[in-house]
């Protein structure tokens, strides 16, 4: 029950996380104009991974996509790539994890197969989350670097007010959405990996049946084969019939010359 709950929760958390990564990638507010110490202006600028926007004080907004691909900064291209890889891996992970869910029965799929699929999707979610966190962090680092470079190039404007030559940009809402979403996807992935351990069958008993000549004779007992401990004895008494065939579970102490292996 706990395994199913962990797996289900991991799936839901990852689903929310990936939805957040998609939302962050599509959002326009990755960087927003820093309004601190800024000349009073009727317009407000903000940029995303795909387009740049200008908003008027009235609320009217005009946006324009980055049409050129080669002219874009390498860092922006890297962030785009990381976010897209995160989304693709996350989407594949979601697809795999749907089939891996313990509460969903698909044909005669064994628990070992479900465990493998759960582990695969968990790893995919972890990598997806890391890609998103890395992408957002690279962009944030770029903003911080540019912010302080702009601050270094200051001059004293009219009225003695210190101004920057360039407009400074600060963290937009998309960065926070991306960080949270990446974190959720990562947590979901870890939960799926934990659930995988509970899904994997820990021991497999192969019941050995031995046949002998006499009904009152003693059966050869190899001991139940255990995946974890090797050969071991089993103390359960389980009588099948009074004839020649007995299970390995039936404890017999004195082997006789009539036993056949």
């Amino acid at each position: 029950m706990a395994v199913t709950a962990c797996q289900g929760l991991g799936f839901v958390v990852s689903l929310i996380g990936i939805a957040g990564i998609i939302a962050a990638t599509c959002m326009d507010q990755w960087s927003t104009q820093d309004l601190y110490n800024n000349p009073v202006t009727a317009v407000f600028n903000y940029q995303g991974l795909w387009r740049s926007c200008v908003r008027e004080s009235s609320g009217f907004t005009e946006c324009r996509g980055y049409f050129t691909l080669l002219g874009l900064p390498a860092m922006l291209q890297a962030v785009r790539a990381l976010m897209i890889v995160g989304i693709v891996l996350g989407a594949i992970g979601l697809l795999v994890s749907i089939f891996a869910l313990k509460c969903i029965r698909i044909g005669s799929m064994e628990d070992s197969a479900k465990a493998n699929m759960t582990l695969t999707s968990g790893i995919m979610f972890i990598v997806s989350g890391l890609c998103a966190i890395a992408g957002v962090s690279v962009f944030a680092n770029m903003l911080v670097t540019n912010f302080w470079m702009s601050t270094a190039n200051m001059y004293t404007g009219m009225g003695g007010m210190v101004q920057t030559v360039q407009t400074r940009y600060t963290f937009g809402a998309a960065l926070f959405v991306g960080w949270v979403a990446g974190g959720l996807t990562l947590i979901g992935g870890v939960m799926m990996c934990i659930a995988c351990r509970g899904l994997a069958p820990e021991e497999t008993n192969y019941k050995a049946v031995s046949y002998h000549a006499s009904g009152h004779s003693v059966a050869y007992k190899p001991g139940g084969f255990k995946a974890s401990t090797g050969f071991g004895s089993n103390t359960k008494n389980k009588k099948i019939y009074d004839g020649g065939a007995r299970t390995e579970d039936e404890v017999q102490s004195y082997p006789s010359k009539h036993d056949y292996v």
């Epitope: 104009q33 000349p39 202006t41 317009v43 600028n45 940029q47 740049s52 200008v54 008027e56 009217f60 005009e62 324009r64 980055y66 049409f67 702009s150 190039n153 101004q163 920057t164 030559v165 360039q166 407009t167």
Partner: nanobody, 123 residues
């Protein structure tokens, strides 16, 4: 990269009008935010007006608001500045500038600049 050439400057009396033009060499003119800056003798660069890609949003310096009008014709790759009710303090070299992503009043945000056209206001 876009090349900008200003024209239309000259001598005008106070209260008069003048129309400046800025022709862009690049056919991707519509993908740039455009601005007009001016520099009076012995002073720094001052923002005059700016306009977004399609002309939907315009921004003006307080000193020119209501007197100057910025406009663009993307089919002709040209930016305009209509200057009315000119004053002595409007005399300066007017520069046309372009940048791809932001409409700001800071000269450092503009990547491409014209050579400038001189506007003289004198009686």
């Amino acid at each position: 990269q876009v090349q900008l050439v200003e024209s239309g400057g000259g001598l005008v009396q106070p209260g008069g009008s003048l129309r400046l033009s800025c022709a862009a060499s690049d056919s991707t003119f519509s993908s740039y935010i455009m601005g007009w800056f001016r520099q009076a003798p012995g002073k720094g660069l001052e923002f005059v007006a700016g306009i977004t890609w399609s002309g939907g949003i315009k921004d003006y310096a307080d000193s020119v608001k209501g007197r100057f009008t910025i406009a663009r014709d993307n089919s002709k790759n040209t930016l305009y500045l209509q200057m009315n009710s000119l004053r002595a303090e409007d005399a300066a070299v007017y520069y046309c500038a372009a940048n791809a992503i932001q409409l700001t009043r800071r000269s450092g945000d503009y990547a491409y600049w014209g050579q400038g056209t001189l506007v003289t206001v004198s009686s």
